[in-house]
Interface confidence: low
């Protein structure tokens, strides 16, 4: 994992003293534009938890590997999510810190929760200031769940997340309904990509057994050690006040790591430094406890004493985590009887030894089968053993055989022989085999005969369009499975090659020979049928259709709607580019036209069977709008409308339609028919007094025509409220059509 730590100073009496520091222990980290790549970034992440804008925060760089954020003016500035990004290239890593307001209504019992895939996560929000309203849980800013206020258990609101999966990771919050978001309890859930104790693609590899609260990284199997511990399994404690992967960093200030929260790369999350606990990391561990958040228990034996930073301190003559082991003549510990490496790799071999006097780096050596002696390049000294690390030169086949680790001290010597097998990475002898093809996918059997050694751990399939110079696409698959290459182009040739890997570093073999595979474009077979259609205007038609919805893939890219105007001998085609679509609105049609309509499924350039046709008659277009509409109030409940007939009428008007609406009103308008088309005025009765109304009208021949201009007029006086508008044209009362 990248050596990146985000420190939060939690002495919160004065926000202006609050600071965040991001420290990188990576070689050359943060130097920016030179060969080491991008600098350290430290910023507030406002995507999920937004706080009121304030003065900009100040960023100060201290050398190449440290950056500090200051300038918080008020407590609300602190609430939310902060992130530090460091490392270069594929090692670029983001470390996240979530800050809760100490005065919030709800506080998290524990901010960071790291769980394994498939576990049940329980987030617990403790009531700090009670409100008798529901509690809303959110996930990454989106609504997730609601708890009734009296569902609190022992003063806590619990959110249970069973069978969590990596996509469940993120920022969770619990907030009282209608309370400020700043009073929320914020949590961070980290879901490892594997079950407990497993890592790697397919989670097939076993974690090393991280000690002292270290967390196994699900991608590379390394232990992410709590602040204050180091070593491949976090087996060694740093001196008080130190942190970083090699204990190289020192906590600032005279009180060491008190009051600091340490955030490390996922899947560790955040905790207090070693020896401290509490929501503000200001409380020392209780007797018998040690480590980050004081989560570990000493249980020292044989007179050992508990140090809250490092655990058991053993008296002379004893060693071990609990001082349970006595010193003795040197002894090689836990040496595997057989090791396997891949050809041309440069592995590291560890050899651990214990004894009294204690073995040191120079007292442990490694002998190859040809008699060459290797001296260790590095030694990890722990209370109960010394582990010497040997960097082996590039392996050749002749290195297969028995190797020996030997330890010598004045107390004696010990040696342990072990077998090293040098394996040859597999190389395919044949091209992969095509099983089935579709328009956008190829199903391939990738496992072919190969030279070299098995077992095959992963199969990589490399593919790209034939004769293309673009990068190869790669898919990694399980050796026992057929591979489906997805999202391909129809009717296209693809060059496909296999690369095999065996377990271990350097296990990738050379690419096998290429083969050409061509995608298909099968004809769509399903016949749609027209379910219905309705006219939405003189030139608009809404059409809906169905398919026999059946199991299996739908062979089709979309639908083609065809409208045949037999009178004019014209065909209109409308493409609906979603195979899920079942409705379309056709616009710009010719009013009064008789159309024949059908629909068919298409796939690539192929058309499926057309639906049985439908025959649709669009209504003719209506007359032009009436002219010079004018409104005149006659009383507190009557308004007279006058107008002029439309010009250039295509036929005799059958009626006029008047639309009446209260100005600024939200209700539906009223439509009133004027059934005497020769009239050019009408009186609308039954209106409310002192009320402003809007009027417009249109004529009808066979279809309704265009609306006139809208006119406004107010009724007079302050009479009684009328029952609703009616219309009178000269002497005759007309019906109301709403």
């Amino acid at each position: 994992a990248v050596d990146l730590t985000l420190l939060a100073n939690l002495r919160l009496t004065d926000p202006q003293r609050f600071f965040l520091t991001c420290v990188s222990g990576e070689a050359g980290a943060g130097r920016g534009s030179d060969a080491w790549g991008p600098p350290l970034l430290l910023e507030k992440d406002d995507r999920i938890v937004r706080t009121p804008p304030g003065p900009p925060l100040r960023l100060a760089r201290n050398g190449s590997h440290q950056v500090t954020l200051r300038g918080f003016s008020k407590p609300s500035d602190l609430v939310g999510v902060f992130s530090c990004v460091g490392g270069a290239g594929a090692r670029r890593t983001r470390v996240i810190y979530v800050h809760n307001s100490p005065g919030a209504h709800l506080l998290p019992d524990k901010v960071t929760h790291t769980v394994n895939k498939g576990d049940t996560a329980v987030l617990s929000a403790r009531v700090h200031k009670e409100k008798q309203t529901d509690v809303i849980w959110k996930s990454n800013g989106s609504y997730f769940y609601t708890l009734d206020w009296h569902e609190a258990q022992d003063g806590r609101f619990l959110l249970q997340l069973p069978n969590v999966q990596p996509p469940s990771s993120g920022i969770y919050s619990a907030t009282y309904l209608e309370a400020s978001p700043l009073g929320s309890a914020f949590f961070r859930l980290i879901v490892r990509g594997c079950g407990a104790g497993r890592w790697g693609p397919g989670c097939t590899k076993e974690c090393p057994g991280c000690l002292h609260g270290g967390v196994c990284h699900d991608h590379d199997g390394e232990c992410v050690c709590p602040p204050g511990f180091t070593g491949t399994r976090c087996e060694q404690a740093c001196r008080e006040g130190r942190f970083g992967q090699s204990c190289q960093e020192q906590c600032p200030g005279i009180s060491g790591c008190r009051g600091l929260t340490f955030c490390l790369p996922d899947p560790y999350g955040c905790s207090c430094g070693s020896g401290w606990r509490g929501s503000q990391c200001q409380e020392a561990c209780a007797p018998g406890h040690f480590g980050a958040d004081c989560r570990l228990q000493c249980q020292c034996q044989n007179g050992g004493t508990c140090d809250r930073f490092s655990g058991c301190v053993c008296p002379s003559g004893w060693h071990g985590v609990h001082c349970e082991k006595s010193d003795r003549i040197p002894q090689i510990l836990n040496m595997a009887s057989e090791l396997e490496f891949n050809l041309e790799t440069m592995p590291r071999i560890n050899c651990a030894a214990a004894g009294n006097p204690f073995p040191v780096r120079g007292s442990i050596e490694l002998r190859k089968p040809d008699g060459t002696v290797l001296l260790s390049t590095k030694a990890i000294v722990e209370p109960e053993k010394t582990t010497a690390e040997f960097e082996v030169p590039r392996l050749v086949l002749a290195d297969s055989g028995f190797w020996e680790c030997r330890v010598s001290t004045s107390g004696g010597q010990d040696s342990r022989r072990f077998k090293v097998n040098v394996k040859v990475p597999p190389v395919p002898l044949a091209a992969p085999r095509l099983l089935t093809k579709q328009s956008r996918q190829l199903v391939v059997s990738p496992l072919v005969s190969f030279s070299g050694d098995g077992p095959i751990s992963t199969v990589r399939l490399h593919y790209r369009p034939q004769d293309s110079t673009m990068d190869w696409s790669t898919i990694v698959v399980d050796p026992s499975e057929n591979v489906t290459l997805m999202n391909l182009r129809p009717k296209t040739g693809y060059s496909v090659r296999v690369q095999l890997s065996r377990p271990g570093e350097g296990g990738e073999g050379a690419w096998g020979p290429p083969t050409l595979m061509t995608t298909d474009c099968p004809e769509p077979l399903l016949q749609p049928w027209l379910e219905g259609w309705h006219v939405e205007g003189t030139d608009r038609l809404r059409v809906s259709w169905s398919l026999p919805l059946v199991p299996g893939p739908l062979v089709g890219d979309g639908f083609l709607l065809r409208l045949w105007d037999g009178t004019r001998g014209q065909e209109r085609r409308e493409n609906v580019s979603s195979p899920q679509a079942r409705t379309a609105l056709l616009t710009g049609l010719t009013p009064g036209t008789h159309y024949q309509l059908d629909v068919q499924l298409y796939h690539c350039t192929l058309l499926g069977p057309a639906s049985p046709p439908a025959h649709v008659l669009l209504p003719p277009s209506g007359p032009p709008a009436p002219r010079h509409l004018h409104a005149q109030a006659l009383s507190d409940s009557e308004i007279q409308l006058t107008w002029k007939h439309p010009e250039a009428l295509p036929g005799p008007i059958s009626k006029y339609v008047v639309e009446v609406q209260v100005a600024g009103g939200a209700g539906d308008p009223l439509w009133i028919d004027v059934d005497r088309p020769e009239e050019t005025s009408t009186i609308i009765r039954g209106l409310n007094a002192s009320t402003r109304y809007l009027f417009r009208m249109r004529a009808s021949i066979q279809g309704l025509g265009d609306w006139s201009n809208t006119v406004e007029e107010s009724t007079l006086g302050n009479g009684l409220q009328a029952e609703g508008p009616v219309q009178e044209s000269r002497a005759a009362e007309e019906g109301l059509d709403q």
Partner: antibody, heavy 117, light 107 residues
């Protein structure tokens, strides 16, 4: 009335062949996906095969793949299942069914196939 | 293949009771789940498709719910004609698979 009627079942020896038919009426047969499902005595339902409207697509359960062939004659509104290399474990009531809206909405009354020496 | 597991396999209840039958898929099947009722010597009858849509002519006391991998068939008030065997079925991918069935008997 929408109806499916199976026929062609009977007693056959292991290794023998049988052809089942399913006559459809009351709906436009050529528009629908059709399927065969079977049920061994006292056991649950097992999907056997499916054919798409034009006959161009067919799928089979692993237990019958290579031995059974599904086909249809849209002009005769009839679905077929040709069963070769029959085994004792193929003994079951065979139902034909119509597929629509991701379900089997119409089923025949079934025909019994017994494979025994 | 997607395995469908029904529970319980056997259920004893009285007329007027509310009963639920659960169906679990070995992997996600979206909402592509149907429920069937079968009486001895008869062909299965479609009750519910697309997880919760009632087939035409099926009484409203039958209802379905769920999505992904967990699904439920509920009968709100048992009637004498409801005592039968019930099957769930996934239509997400081939091979189409059925649950092993739940036999509902009169107590």
């Amino acid at each position: 009335e929408v109806q499916l009627l199976e026929s062609g079942g009977g007693l056959v020896q292991p290794g023998g062949s049988l052809r089942l038919s399913c006559a459809a009426s009351g709906f436009t047969f050529s528009r629908y996906v059709m399927l065969w499902v079977r049920q061994a005595p006292g056991k649950g339902l097992e999907w056997v095969s499916v054919i798409y409207p034009s006959g161009g697509y067919t799928y089979y359960a692993d237990s019958v793949k290579g031995r059974f062939t599904i086909s249809r004659d849209n002009s005769k509104n009839t679905l077929y299942l040709q069963m070769n290399s029959l085994r004792a474990e193929d003994t079951a009531v065979y139902y034909c069914a119509r597929g629509v809206l991701r379900a089997f909405d119409i089923w025949g009354q079934g025909t019994m196939v017994t494979v025994s020496s | 293949d997607i395995q469908m597991t029904q529970s319980p396999s056997f259920l004893s209840a009285s007329v007027g009771d509310r009963v639920t039958i659960t169906c679990r898929a070995s992997q996600g099947i979206s909402t592509y789940l149907a429920w069937y009722q079968q009486k001895p010597g008869k062909a299965p009858k479609l009750l519910i498709y697309a997880t919760s849509t009632l087939q035409s002519g099926v009484p409203s006391r039958f209802s379905g719910s769920g999505s992904g991998t967990e699904f439920t068939l509920a009968i709100s008030t048992l009637q004498p004609e409801d005592f039968a065997t019930y099957y769930c079925q996934q239509l997400n991918s081939y091979p189409i698979t059925f649950g092993q069935g739940t036999r509902l008997e009169i107590k």
